[in-house]
Interface confidence: medium
């Protein structure tokens, strides 16, 4: 891990690209601009990464430390049940939903929330560090 810290965005962590944060053996990108879900997905894929898929509660709570009240798209969609972008099931957390048309997932510092996929939000990309 970089300079003894759990996570870092510093220049002394060459294993992640500029503007990406390293944690463990992964790199994370927190966007500033906003896009709809599919455009966010395509942004991540074009950068050799994927929309954030969270492995467990530990990773989720760590990432939430970096988030504000603003929601960020993650690689979660309701496709006959809530599943991550790769098709694996969401099984360690619940997701809050107000409507059946809210079929894409977003995260903020407090929770996972369903949203309409056409809404423009910030997003988080994730990839394995080199």
């Amino acid at each position: 891990l970089c300079q003894g810290s759990k996570y870092s965005t510093c220049a002394s962590c060459p294993s992640c690209p500029d503007h990406w944060m390293k944690y463990g053996n992964h790199c994370y990108y927190f966007s500033v601009e906003k896009k709809d879900w599919i455009s966010s997905l395509e942004f991540c894929l074009a950068r050799d990464s994927h929309l954030l898929m969270i492995t467990d509660k530990q990773e989720m709570s760590l990432l939430q430390d970096f988030l504000s009240e603003a929601f960020h798209w993650v690689g979660l969609r309701n496709n006959s049940g809530w599943r991550w972008e790769d098709g694996s099931p969401l099984n360690f957390s619940r997701i809050y939903s107000n409507s059946l048309v809210q079929t894409c997932g977003a995260i903020n510092k407090n929770s996972l929330q369903a949203s309409s996929c056409e809404v423009s939000l910030q997003w988080v990309c994730k990839k394995v560090s080199p």
Partner: antibody, heavy 116, light 108 residues
Framework: QVQLKQSGPGLVQPSQSLSITCTVS????????VHWVRQSPGKGLEWLGV???????DYNAAFISRLSIRKDNSKSQVFFKMNSLQTNDTAIYYC??????????WGQGTSVTVSS | QIVLTQSPTIMSASLGERVTMTCTAS???????LHWYQQKPGSSPKLWIY???NLASGVPARFSGSGSGTSYSLTISSMEAEDAATYYC?????????FGAGTKLELK
């Protein structure tokens, strides 16, 4: 470089089970899911199931009652087992790595004939 | 289940000829999750085009892909001998994952 190497029997008796091991290198099973697909002259390419990086599994509903996929991350091995094989299960069985958004590397295939 | 129908089943082309094959889905598929694989006899399928139009590593630039919704296609701008193979479309959009029956491309 990324490799998936399969080992398993070529001939299986009807009603017996098929076991195939997929040993991977060049990537970790803790960060990539592994899918299983078979190919037969009659049915083409058929998706059978997947074991996700976190260890959970999903199966094609048509095979769920007789299919089991498990893995050993430390040995970089994925284990495929299908029970109660019949002659129409004769096919080439493949393991394939998932690297979003697609299965990008496939094993060499295990040719399985079900016959007495 | 999403059924993928490929056409034609078999086709032949001369060297230098432009080739187009199609893949039609029974229901809409996200272009991000529509892929093409190339397979030659005795070999495993190789990822050839991913997310509708992106060439996999090492794939010649004469290949291209396009489409959206339920209609997708793979095009070779100028046929070469090494392109003779079977091409399968595949959807990673919805479980169970499915593949087309393939288009076998032969050299005329």
């Amino acid at each position: 470089q990324v490799q998936l190497k399969q080992s398993g029997p070529g001939l299986v008796q009807p009603s017996q089970s098929l076991s195939i091991t997929c040993t991977v290198s060049g990537f970790s099973l803790t960060t990539h899911g592994v899918h299983w697909v078979r190919q037969s002259p009659g049915k083409g390419l058929e998706w059978l199931g997947v074991i996700w990086s976190g260890g959970s599994t999903d199966y094609n509903a048509a095979f769920i009652s007789r299919l089991s996929i498990r893995k050993d991350n430390s040995k970089s091995q994925v284990f495929f087992k299908m029970n109660s094989l019949q002659t129409n299960d004769t096919a080439i069985y493949y393991c394939a790595r998932l690297r979003l958004p697609a299965m990008d590397y496939w094993g060499q295939g295990t040719s399985v004939t079900v016959s007495s | 289940q999403i059924v993928l129908t490929q056409s034609p089943t078999i086709m032949s082309a001369s060297l230098g000829e432009r080739v187009t094959m199609t893949c039609t889905a029974s229901s809409s598929v996200s272009s991000t999750y529509l892929h093409w694989y190339q397979q030659k006899p005795g070999s495993s399928p190789k990822l050839w085009i991913y997310s509708t139009s992106n060439l996999a590593s090492g794939v010649p630039a004469r290949f291209s892909g396009s489409g959206s919704g339920t209609s997708y296609s793979l095009t070779i701008s100028s046929m070469e001998a090494e392109d003779a193979a079977t091409y399968y479309c595949h959807q990673y959009h919805r479980s169970p994952l499915s593949f087309g029956a393939g288009t076998k491309l032969e050299l005329k």
